[in-house]
Structure formats: C-alpha cells, structure tokens
C-alpha cells in the first residue's frame, strides 16, 4: 500500500514509496522537505501560507543558517523551517491511527539539522529503521539554532527562543496534519537527544503545547541542564552587536538594528575556539533558551504541573562527561598525559563558583575519595568523566525524574542508563557510552549499515527501538508491537528504578538508586551551603574579542562547542550551573 | 475574471450516481486547487474533498471516502464530482469553489447545483 | 476532525450597530476564514488567514483572533450585511461552523 499525494492544510505533498524488500510488500513512505512555517529574522514564527498544486516531497531541504566546521563562514539558509516525515506501509491498506515520534535533533542549540549528519547519503536522522520495526510514523525538521534561534536582550525587544518556537511550530502543524498521512494527532511523541532533548523538556514544560504532546523521551539532556537556560542573555547580544556595529545601550534601537543586519554576519560574529578556556565549556554556550516569561514563563523548575499527563522516559549515557572533560581537562584522553589534582581542582571550582571556596572543597573532597586507594591515571580521569557527567547530565536528569513523578496524574515515568561503550577505537579502554552514542542505536544504523556494526550493537539497536517505540504506542516500554529483552520497571521516588542498557539487557539489568551517594550530595550537601557571589545570575561573563576560529565538532549532534578565547580577562565567571 | 459554471440541477432516484460538472474560465485551469462543498435545504456547509487539476490528485472527506469520485479535463477546464449510492440525506446544493491563493481560502465559487434524492 | 461552534446561532440587530461573531475550534488552527452566504446564493469569501480582508470587502468587516477563539466583527451594520455568516479552518480536512444568522431587530 502506498499514500500518494497526501492533502495537508498548506496544500497537496506527494513524497516517494519504497519498497523495503523486491518482493513487493512492506513499504514505508516518505516525504521530505514540507514547510511548516515561515521566519523572518528575529522574528517569532508564523504559519506558512501554503501552495497550489502537488508539492514533490523528495529531497531534505537545507538546514538551519549555522556556521560550517571551519567557523570562517556559514552554510544552510534562513528558509529552512521544512519537515520530514516517514511512514510505514503493510502490504494492503494504507496505515491508519499510527503512532508518532517528533525528533528534536541536538547540537547546543548552534547546529544541527532534522537529517542529521550525513556520510554518502546515509542520514544519522533517517527515520525509516524506527518507523518500519516499530509501526510507527517518523517525522523530523529544522529549527533555528544559534544567534538566529536565541539571540535575546532578555526583554521584549528580542525575547529569544525563536528556536523553540520553531519546534512548537512543528509540533503544532504535526497534531492538525499527521491524521492526513495515517498518524494519531492523539498520541505524539516527542523525542531528542542533547539539546534537543532539553528542547523536548522545555517543549513539554511550555503552556504553549498544552494538549499537543503525549508522550517525550530525553537522551542526555533537560530543561534543568545548566546549559540549557541562559541567565544572561543581554550581554551576549550586546557582544553580538558590538561586532557587527549595532547600537548597544538601547534594545529597542540594538534590536531593530540586528534584525536587518546580514544573517551571515550574526552567525559568524560568535566564534568558537578550541583552546582549553579558564572555565568549563558550557558557561561559554551563548544562545540557548530564556525565560521569556511567555513561552517559557518561569525557571523549569517550578513549570512541572504542566507535564502531569505527559508520560516520560529521560536517560543519560554513563559517560556523557566525556566529550566535555576532553575540551575541559584535555589529559583525560592523552594516554601520555596526567590529570592532576590542579587539573580537577580547576574544573571543580569553575562549576561550583555559586558557593565559593566551601562548595569547591566539598565537591572536591568527595569526588576524590577513591584517589587515596587508587591514584592511578585511569582512576582519575575517570573522576574528571564521572563529574562532567554528574553536573552535566546525571544530577539535572535526577532532579527532573523526581519532579516529573512528583506531579504526574495520568503520567508514567521511565529512567535509564545507556552504558553500551562507545565504538571510537582512538578512546582509552575505560571508556564508556560517550554523549551522542546513543544515536545510532536509537535510529538503527547497525541494520542501515550492517557491515560497520557488530551482533552486539544490533541487539542494542533493536532492544532500543523496540522499548522507545513500545512508548510511543502505549506510554509503557513492554507493551506495544515488538517484544523486549527485560521488563522496565517505572521510576519511583523510592528506588530510583532504571534500566541499565547494555549489550545483554536481562532482569538484572533493572537497577536502582544510581549514583545514589553524589546525588544526595548535590541535592543536599552542596545545596544548603551559602551562595557566595550573591546573585550570580546578574554577573558578566568574561568578554570575548577574539577572532580566532576553531573546528567545532563535525556530528550536528555533539553537543558542546568550544568557548571564546579571551586570555586578557580575568573577571569573575558567572555560575550558570545552580543545583 | 475567475468564472465556475456548474451543470444544472438534477433528480435522482436513491442508490443512483449523479455526476456534476464545474467549468472554469478566467485563469489557468491547472494552477489552482477545485473543491466540493454540499449544502442541504437550511443547513450548513459542508466540505467533500478536494482535486488538483494539474495532476489529479484527490483528498476527500472521510465521510464521502469511497462514495465520491472527483476527476477533471484539462482539455475543456472542467472538473467533476460524481457522487454514488446516493440516499435522501444527499440532496443538497452542491458547489464548486477554487482556491484564493496558496493553501487559502475558498475566494470563487460556482452557482451550486441542486441535486435532489427522492424515489 | 477539528470542530467549530460559532456563537451566537442567530442575532438580531440594526443598521449602525456593531456586532461580532466568535468561532471557536475544538484545537488549535493555523487557518481560518470566514464567509457570507445570502439565501439562495453561493458564499462569499469576507476575510481569510482571521484577519484579511478579501479584495472588494468593505472595511467595516474586520476579523481577529488566533488558536482556537476567533471573531468577525462588523463595525457599523448596513442593510446589505444582513445575511448568514459561516467560518472556516482550513486543514488536512477543513470544516466549517454551523452559521450565525444576522438578522433585522
């Protein structure tokens, strides 16, 4: 069976069939590059006034302005709100009533796109593994990410969150069109990794959709990151502005100016270099979501009664640190080169600088506990790993768990860890699951791609897909149209239940309390202790004037860019991480 | 200026086709969507479907699906909707109408015709 | 499908007054539209994307709204404005509301 043209309310859209054996038979359908709105820059989305006649759905539209890898110039364009979709056809009705999965792609809100990184046109975020194994409708698109997404003065005058938008966008035109193309508008659900998967919790924490999202799964990332709120938006758009010759010292007039300046120039006025800055990488991630007071009305944390019919599955992978200690404590994967305790004192304190010398010594101390029995290089940085990953990921993803349970209704909650360890054969042999590992499992390239894969990785690749979209059919992992290896228990506020994703998944795989004792510490301990620097949200990060362009990561879903370089500053550095 | 003249009204016995006929004249035939729109005796509107005539693409109102059939000639501008099994509840004034611009309104419309269902 | 409840059904007023119809739709819409149909006439496009004016619509007709709450308004009632008046969303499967009939007090 196959679609054909397929009326949506912009206009007819015709996308191709593929047959998945030369049998005949199962097929899945797919369209791509539909518009689903339109942006002018800066400007908050608007709907797309359609066309006339069939719209030939055939090839990925380019993705959102961005810069390229060298930073020295841009690719993409302004029109690039466009959505994929993929549709899995039996062999005689066409499907009907299926279930749909949104992927919200990551990429730290500066790049990325709906396709995702691609090697001789294998797609990282081709959609048709998790359509035709699990039955489910696939849909993907753009967003605006950078400058273009979430420039902001922190007023009205550029609000911010464009990017945001963009994705309620798509989810909007997603619940009044998918019925169109055989999909359930009653049961979406939303699903990212990284920044995407803050951007699905943000999406489900806006009163914007309400109604609009069943079900969301959050790989490595949530609206409590502490990268994912920028508390301090009006300096960075005064930096912005500054280097393309805008007025700074009114936002209406600073506004009006970045609204007709080239978009190509906004995007490269922020630059990225690869030098080891003096605080972590995350507190040099500009533009990302705001608290706009409307589409976002207030901080995350207290926006969890919105989610309470949302059921949810959020998971981290058991190094996610990793990426982030390599740019912040670069040692961490030169097998010649130590870590010292210099080294992770320094890392230590620029996470903890809302609470001074006390909150220092106190991370310090207990994250280093096991050195005096094992001061091996291995066991060190793998403490540098473990507490990237804990500030990062793990303790934002715990606290978030807790709320979403604390206030469901109807909602199931779901927790995992994915420890499949990561197939790169240039990290040491300790390695875990890398941040952005999970991806190619979630989207099947060990059956897209057989001969790079292992046994092993197809049998993650299927457990996850079956459990992810088993989720999207029911709100339970076990019950849907595939079978899985174990059952998943839900969260519970008392045992701390998640699943464990490995290789072999089997009843022991079900586990508790994870990292129970930094947690407690983070959540207790570290949180009663005195907030030093006042009120760190109103402080100035250190200004950046250089020019000096490095090589951010190639995969549109790694999530961490390189801070500016500026070694003439000395200033204080805000705490954007407040646990 | 945009014209859609539609066929005349019609009689039908229950469990008969009709076919009704929209002529378009005015603009380039294949450029805009044509859709159906019914409206019984002191009732409301109601959509049917839609054709593209460029190529012949249809969608139809899931009500219809499977009773309503809608083609068109490129030859003489002229769309059709043939309505099937028809019942009581089909009579109505059927009519025509063409899109405004892109994925608008409906901003031209056809007389309507009346297509009455009794045995 | 998305439905649309347009209030009041009927409406009596009389020329200069300003009136205003509301339609709602039973989700959010991206599309809506609305018409005046005379007995015995087909309908005519007033107002499409909740506040455009048609060419040729005096502008007296005006229309807001966004989601799922809409009006038309007519500021200053003439005789020719009696009439039913219906709106529209347009999607994968457009429907319309019931109609407001606009009648003479």
């Known amino acids: 069976a196959k679609l054909g043209a397929v009326y949506t309310e912009g206009g007819f859209v015709e996308g191709v069939n593929k047959k998945l054996s030369l049998l005949g038979g199962d097929s899945v359908d797919i369209f791509k590059g539909i518009p689903f709105a339109t942006a002018k820059t800066l400007e908050n989305p608007q709907r797309h006034p359609g066309w006339q006649g069939t719209l030939k759905a055939t090839n990925f539209k380019k993705r959102c302005l961005q810069a390229t890898i060298t930073q020295d110039n841009t690719y993409g364009q302004e029109d690039c709100l466009y959505l994929n979709i993929w549709v899995p056809q039996g062999r005689k009705q066409v499907s009907h009533n299926l279930p749909v999965m949104v992927w919200i792609y990551g990429g730290a809100f500066l790049m990325g796109s709906g396709q995702g990184a691609n090697f001789l046109k294998n797609y990282l975020y081709d959609g048709e593994e998790i359509a035709t194994r699990g039955n489910v409708i696939v849909v993907t698109f753009n967003y605006r990410v950078g400058p273009l997404g979430f420039l902001s003065t922190g007023d009205a005058n550029l609000p911010g969150n464009f990017g945001l938008r963009d994705q309620h966008m798509a989810i909007a035109w997603v619940k009044r069109n998918i019925a169109a193309f055989g999909g359930d508008p009653d049961n979406i659900t939303i699903f990212g990794e990284s920044a995407g998967a803050a951007s699905v919790s943000l999406q489900t924490l806006s009163p914007y959709n309400k109604g609009l999202i069943r079900r969301a799964i959050s790989q490595s990332g949530m609206a409590l990151s502490p990268w994912a709120i920028q508390k301090n938006p009006l300096f960075w758009a005064k930096t912005i502005a500054k280097k393309v010759g805008c007025p700074t010292e009114d936002t209406g007039k600073m506004a009006a100016c970045l609204k007709i300046t080239d978009p190509r120039a906004l995007t490269l006025a922020y630059k990225l270099p690869v030098k080891k800055q003096e605080y972590p990488v995350v507190h040099y991630l500009a533009f990302i979501p705001v608290i706009d007071g409307d589409f976002i009305p207030d901080d995350p944390i207290n926006l969890y009664n919105n989610t309470a019919d949302i059921d949810y599955i959020a998971g981290i992978n058991n190094m996610d640190g990793h990426l982030f200690a390599t740019i912040d404590v670069p040692a961490v994967d030169k097998t010649k080169q130590t870590v010292t305790e210099e080294d992770f004192y320094r890392l230590v304190s620029g996470h903890t600088v809302a609470k001074g010398l006390k909150g220092a010594q106190a991370t310090f101390d207990i994250y280093t506990e096991s050195w005096a029995q094992d001061p091996s290089q291995e066991n060190m940085k793998k403490t540098v790993v473990a507490f990237e990953t804990d500030v990062l990921f793990l303790i934002p993803t715990e606290i978030a768990l807790a709320q979403h349970k604390a206030h469901a209704k109807s909602a199931k909650t779901y927790s995992y860890l994915f420890s499949h360890p990561s197939r790169m054969p240039i990290y040491p042999k300790w390695m875990g699951a890398d941040h952005a590992d999970d991806l190619q499992y979630v989207f099947g390239k060990p059956f897209a791609t057989p001969l790079g894969y292992r046994p092993q990785d197809r049998a993650v690749s299927k457990a996850m897909i079956a459990y992810w979209t088993n989720f999207a059919r029911s709100g339970d992992p076990n019950m849907g149209n595939s079978p899985v290896p174990t059952h998943w228990y839900p969260y519970t506020l008392e045992n701390g239940n998640y699943l464990d994703i490995t290789k072999t998944i089997t009843s022991a795989s079900m586990k508790e309390h994870l990292r129970e004792k930094f947690l407690k510490f983070w959540a207790v301990t570290f949180e009663v202790l005195p907030t030093v620097t006042g009120d760190q949200d109103t402080l100035t990060p250190p200004e950046d004037d250089s020019e000096v362009a490095p090589d951010p990561p190639s995969d549109d879903s790694q999530v961490v860019p390189v801070p500016p370089t500026d070694d003439s500053v000395e200033a204080q550095m805000p705490a954007t991480i407040g646990f | 200026q945009v014209q859609l003249v539609q066929s005349g009204a019609e009689v039908k016995k229950p469990g008969a086709s009709v076919k009704v006929s929209c002529k378009a004249s005015?603009?380039?035939?294949?450029?805009?969507?044509m859709h159906w729109v019914r409206q019984a005796p002191g009732q409301g509107l109601e959509w049917m479907g839609v054709i593209n005539p460029g190529d012949g693409a249809t969608s139809y109102n899931q009500k219809f699906q499977g009773r309503v059939t809608m083609t068109r000639d490129t030859s003489t501008s002229t769309v059709y909707m043939e309505l099937s099994s028809l019942r009581s509840e089909d009579t109505a004034v059927y009519y025509c109408?063409?899109?405004?611009?892109?994925?608008?309104?409906?901003?031209?419309w056809g007389q309507g015709t009346l297509v009455t269902v009794s045995s | 499908d998305i439905q649309m409840t347009q209030s009041p059904s009927s409406l009596s007023a009389s020329v200069g007054d300003r009136v205003t119809i509301t339609c709602r739709a039973s989700s959010s819409i991206s599309y809506l539209n609305w018409y005046q149909q005379k007995p015995g006439k087909a309908p005519k496009l007033l107002i499409y994307?909740?506040?455009s004016l048609a060419s040729g619509v005096p502008s007296r007709f005006s229309g807001s709204g966004s989601g799922t709450d809409f009006t038309l308004t007519i500021s200053s009632l003439q005789p020719e404005d009696f009439a039913t008046y219906y709106c529209?969303?347009?999607?994968?499967?457009?429907?319309f509301g019931q109609g407001t009939k606009l009648e003479i007090k």
């Open positions: 994307a909740a506040s």
């Open positions: 529209h969303q347009r999607s994968s499967s457009p429907t």
């Open positions: 109408a063409r899109d405004y611009y892109g994925s608008s309104p409906l901003g031209y």
């Open positions: 005015g603009y380039t035939f294949t450029s805009y969507n």
